[in-house]
């Protein structure tokens, strides 16, 4: 199955060139997407090419500049946010990255009605998080781990919390582990729909062990970075949820929301908060042993000014075959009655589907069903539910958008995207305006990405927002590799794979094979998306075949495949990569003396274990920032899949599944180990321990560290990394430079 823009005929082939590594490192063939910044049912904001902030009205067809690029430039703004009453814009500058989502910034408020910046009671700097209320122009912000409230941008702030302390108490923002492994946001505060209440989380990290590493910088002495980071089995953060009335914040102060008794009886997590109305809120909690989740609906008691969470409004979600949810426990999407909701969880056949919960989870009405999975609920309106799934044509690596009419009986289902641009577009996401009056579709491939605007009632395409014409033109004289997505059936397991083939691929010839692996629980690598990246270059210029395989533990193909790795990380993921390689060899075009594997993060762990599997299949391989022992990784992530590293739980497999335990097996492979010294996520410790074990076993290997670089190895390190890995692979495969 060729999933690429069609190629020109042979007569023109001599004018075409292969991809170069420089193309990849310069981002020459990167694409653009267009996500409207919706501000009403029919209006959105977008930053124009010349940096003006422009308001578009779909219905009138008019647009005007709401904020001049002169204003943006005056404070070097890199981001903006319009207040819902449209009177103010915050401008964000001095962006300073912290972890994956978190950053600090300086904020300026521009008054659109007066055409000038607000000067009185300016915001402090740097701010950790800032947001407008959903109505009007109240501001909530986090500064030095405390939350502040402003009724208007020019007003003096009201301090809500006072106990915030660096690395100890976090108010309104998550600590490291909650940011990375639970909330996946930089914030931990939530406005009620009309801005009456503000809910926030307090994380107490006082008792959490600290990871410390050197940051070398330019000074005479390195700095030490200290992060409260709970590794598997360690003491976890203590979380509390509070809600404050923002109209009269000083009246009763923040009120704590009670934790369900069945959750509070042992270590637990808070997983998400969803406002239903101004006086009803839904909290989700999770036991530390992450197979039990409780959804708790709480109501405001006017008489006591407290929040009441009756047991009758507690909904339990439990997994008997694995952990609760997919990567995260799904969040509810409430319907207009403000009590019933739609939620994705496993059905009786072990496939994640949309269910409608009116009273109890036991009585849930299944909305979607089949041997495929519902992936995301985008929007629920009075008469429609929009969701994405991988149902169409039974390709798990596709995403199409569907509409179910919930206003009529029986509900009817329509695929909105399946036949729009069938060859070009098989992987979509969507962005909806208020009441789903309009929506944008963003297609990621397999062809060149395209973003379009649609009528929410008729699904009619209104206009193309971004079609990447420049990219299309730039690729006209490039020999892109061919891509195919197929599946292998092995011992009742379906292994989907993507193969990237050199442009002049000839089945009768032999090619070196590179396996690119991630393989983490609930991940998916085989997706029908467009990419011109390093592996595209390796196929196009260096004549390699590259394969990506989704084995056991990967997502969106049912619980049997997903939960197969439960409590046994590092076993089946590796087995399935090896099985696939053997199948690829059987296809006849792979040079079995030139097979390599590489991966990053979890993929670095899998590639290391595959190299040390003793099969003799791999000549060489690369591990970038690998996990080497699950005892070194974060509690929230690790324990979800592995349980606890205690004797009475799963310590044995924690010990058996390390890379270090297989040090001897690296003797007959060429191994390149790479890690950033300032990796806050997968600590450098992981690679340090691999290196130590290899040295102790007197096994030769290659290594590269990147000073002061984190898990992403960004900036100039990226160029160095890919250049270095290219040399390593070309040497391994005896390819001339």
């Amino acid at each position: 199955i060729v999933l690429r823009p069609s190629r020109v005929h042979n007569s023109e082939e001599n004018t075409m060139r292969a991809l170069t590594l420089k193309d990849i490192l310069n981002g020459t063939f990167s694409y653009k997407t267009f996500f409207p910044n919706w501000i009403s049912g029919q209006e959105y904001l977008h930053q124009s090419a010349d940096n003006n902030i422009v308001l578009y009205n779909i219905e009138t067809g008019q647009s005007y500049t709401i904020l001049s690029n002169r204003t943006m430039k005056s404070v070097n703004a890199s981001n903006y946010g319009l207040s819902p009453d449209r009177q103010f814009v915050y401008l964000e500058s001095d962006y300073s990255k912290l972890w994956r989502y978190s950053y600090t910034a300086t904020y300026y408020i521009y008054d659109l009605s007066n055409g000038e910046f607000v000067r009185g009671n300016e915001l402090p700097r740097p701010i950790q998080y800032l947001c407008w209320s959903p109505v009007g122009s109240k501001l909530a912000y986090v500064y030095q781990n405390n939350i502040y409230l402003k009724q208007r941008p020019g007003d003096p702030p009201f301090q809500i919390t006072f106990n915030g302390r660096e690395n100890k108490i976090f108010n309104g923002i998550p600590d490291w582990v909650y940011e990375e492994e639970m909330l996946a946001t930089k914030y931990a505060l939530w406005w009620s729909p009309n801005g009456k209440f503000l809910a926030y989380a307090e994380f107490n990290d006082t008792d959490i062990p600290v990871i410390a590493y050197s940051y070398y910088g330019d000074e005479q002495y390195p700095r030490t970075i200290n992060i409260p980071y709970p590794k598997a089995g360690a003491k976890n953060p203590v979380v509390r949820i509070f809600i404050i009335d923002t109209t009269y914040p000083a009246y009763v102060g923040p009120q704590e929301v009670p934790v369900p008794a069945m959750i509070a009886s042992s270590d637990y997590y808070f997983s998400w908060l969803t406002w239903v109305t101004d006086e009803r809120v839904c909290l989700q909690w999770l036991k530390r042993v992450q197979n039990v989740s409780v959804l708790s609906i709480c109501d405001f008691r006017e008489d006591w000014q407290t929040w009441d969470c009756p047991k009758t409004q507690e909904h339990i979600e439990e997994s008997r075959t694995g952990w609760a949810g997919g990567f995260f426990v799904s969040t509810p999407v409430f319907s207009y009655d403000a009590i019933s909701y739609y939620k994705i969880f496993s059905d009786k056949d072990g496939y994640k589907h949309i269910h409608y919960i009116k009273d109890t989870v036991e009585n849930a009405i299944q909305i979607t069903s089949g041997k495929w999975e519902a992936i995301n609920i985008f929007r629920v309106t009075q008469d429609s539910l929009f969701y994405s799934s991988n149902e169409f044509e039974e390709y798990p690596g596709r995403r199409n958008i569907y509409r179910i009419s919930i206003g009529s009986y029986p509900p009817s289902k329509k695929c909105v995207t399946c036949h729009l641009r069938k060859e070009r577009c098989q992987y979509y996401t969507a962005s909806f305006s208020d009441y789903a009056k309009y929506y944008a579709l963003v297609c990621y491939g397999p062809g060149i990405p395209i973003s379009t605007l649609h009528d929410g009632r008729t699904d009619q395409e209104i206009k193309i927002l971004e079609e990447n014409k420049e990219l299309e033109n730039a690729l006209k004289n490039i020999q892109l590799p061919k891509e195919e997505i197929k599946k292998l059936e092995v011992d009742e397991i379906t292994l989907w794979y993507k193969m990237i083939l050199p442009p002049q691929f000839d089945r009768s010839k032999k090619y070196p094979l590179l396996i690119q692996v991630y393989g983490g629980p609930c991940s998916q690598s085989v997706r029908s998306v467009f990419a011109v990246n390093w592996i595209s270059y390796l196929a196009s210029k260096e004549g390699m075949v590259i394969a990506l395989v989704d084995g056991r533990g990967t997502a969106f193909q049912g619980d049997k495949l997903l939960y197969a790795v439960y409590r046994k990380l590092g076993v089946y993921e590796v087995e399935d990569q090896i099985t696939a390689v053997r199948k690829f060899i059987e296809m006849g075009f792979i040079d079995e003396k030139r097979i390599a594997i590489w991966g990053w993060s979890y993929g670095g762990y899998v590639s290391s274990l595959a190299l040390a599997s003793g099969t003799g299949l791999f000549k060489c391989g690369i591990a970038v920032a690998p996990v080497s022992s699950w005892e070194y990784y974060a509690s929230v992530y690790t324990e979800r899949f592995m349980g606890l590293p205690t004797k009475d739980d799963n310590l044995e497999h924690y010990k058996n599944s390390t890379v270090m335990a297989r040090a001897e097996y690296f003797r007959n492979v060429d191994y390149l180990l790479i890690h950033g010294t300032a990796d806050d996520n997968v600590h450098f410790q992981n690679s340090a321990q691999i290196a130590k074990a290899l040295v102790n076993a007197q096994v030769d290997f290659q290594a590269m560290w990147y000073s002061d670089q984190n898990h992403g190895l960004s900036g100039l390190s990226t160029n160095h990394l890919y250049t270095h890995m290219t040399h390593f692979l070309k040497q391994c495969f005896s390819l001339s430079d």
Epitope: T71, N114, F117, R119
Partner: antibody, heavy 124, light 113 residues
């Protein structure tokens, strides 16, 4: 020479509404916000509110909120101020004035040109 | 709201003499980021609209005679007419434009002694 020309004097009964116009000329209308200021007999100048012609977003003095509506007609380079539920203490001269938009962070401008004023008398 | 208080309420000065009007704000009008004071002075003659004389506390508007000068910072400001002329008889207002609502002083009436 920049001009801000206001509509003529009005006599209104208590409870009624008045709408005063301010026609501008000889400058780029969208480079300035328009503000309304009133002066009751023997009283200090009092700011009522303003509007940005680029986006039509008004800003009102809380004292007048709910009673005042400021609008613009960009095509006619004209601003309007409507005050409702009039009472005798609203008797005053109403002025419009322009104020340059501050695009830059370090800017900020005073009201440099004013209309001639419109006398509004509220009497039963 | 920022309250602006002028003193004196009225002032009689001989022709050619110096006239000094003070204005005090309830909050500082000095903007730390650009070290500018967001204060203006206006002149209003009977039956006429106010006319801008001084902005940023000390910068003369173009066309304003140099006998008019402004000074001060923070909360205390002064308008000085170095040599009073007959055409300077008017009411003078200070106004802050540091924050909203914009507010004016109560005015100082300048007459010839």
């Amino acid at each position: 020479q920049v001009q801000l020309v206001q509509s003529g004097a009005e006599v209104k009964k208590p409870g009624a509404s008045v709408k005063v116009s301010c026609k501008t000329s000889r400058y780029t209308f969208t480079e300035y916000t328009i503000h309304w200021v009133r002066q009751a007999p023997g009283q200090r100048l009092e700011w009522i509110g303003g509007i940005n012609p680029n986006n039509g977003i008004p800003n009102y003095n809380q004292k007048f909120k709910g009673r005042v509506t400021i609008t613009v007609d960009t095509s006619a380079s004209t601003a309007y101020m409507e005050l409702s539920s009039l009472r005798s203490e609203d008797t005053a001269v109403y002025y419009c004035a322009r104020r340059r938009i501050a695009y830059g962070y370090d800017e900020g401008h005073a009201m440099d040109y004013w209309g001639q004023g419109t006398l509004v008398t509220v009497s039963s | 709201d920022i309250v602006m208080t002028q003193s004196p309420d009225s002032l009689a000065v001989s022709l050619g003499e110096r006239a000094t009007i003070n204005c005090k704000s309830s909050e500082s009008l000095l903007y730390s980021r650009n070290q500018k004071n967001y204060l203006a002075w206006y002149q209003q003659k009977p039956g006429q609209p106010p006319k801008l004389l001084i902005f940023w506390a000390s910068t003369r508007e173009s066309g304003v005679p140099d006998r008019f000068s402004g000074s001060g910072f923070g909360t205390d400001f002064t308008l000085t007419i170095s040599s009073l002329q007959a055409e300077d008889v008017a009411v003078y207002y200070c106004q802050q434009y540091f924050s909203y609502p914009l507010t004016f002083g109560q005015g100082t009436k300048v007459e010839i002694k």
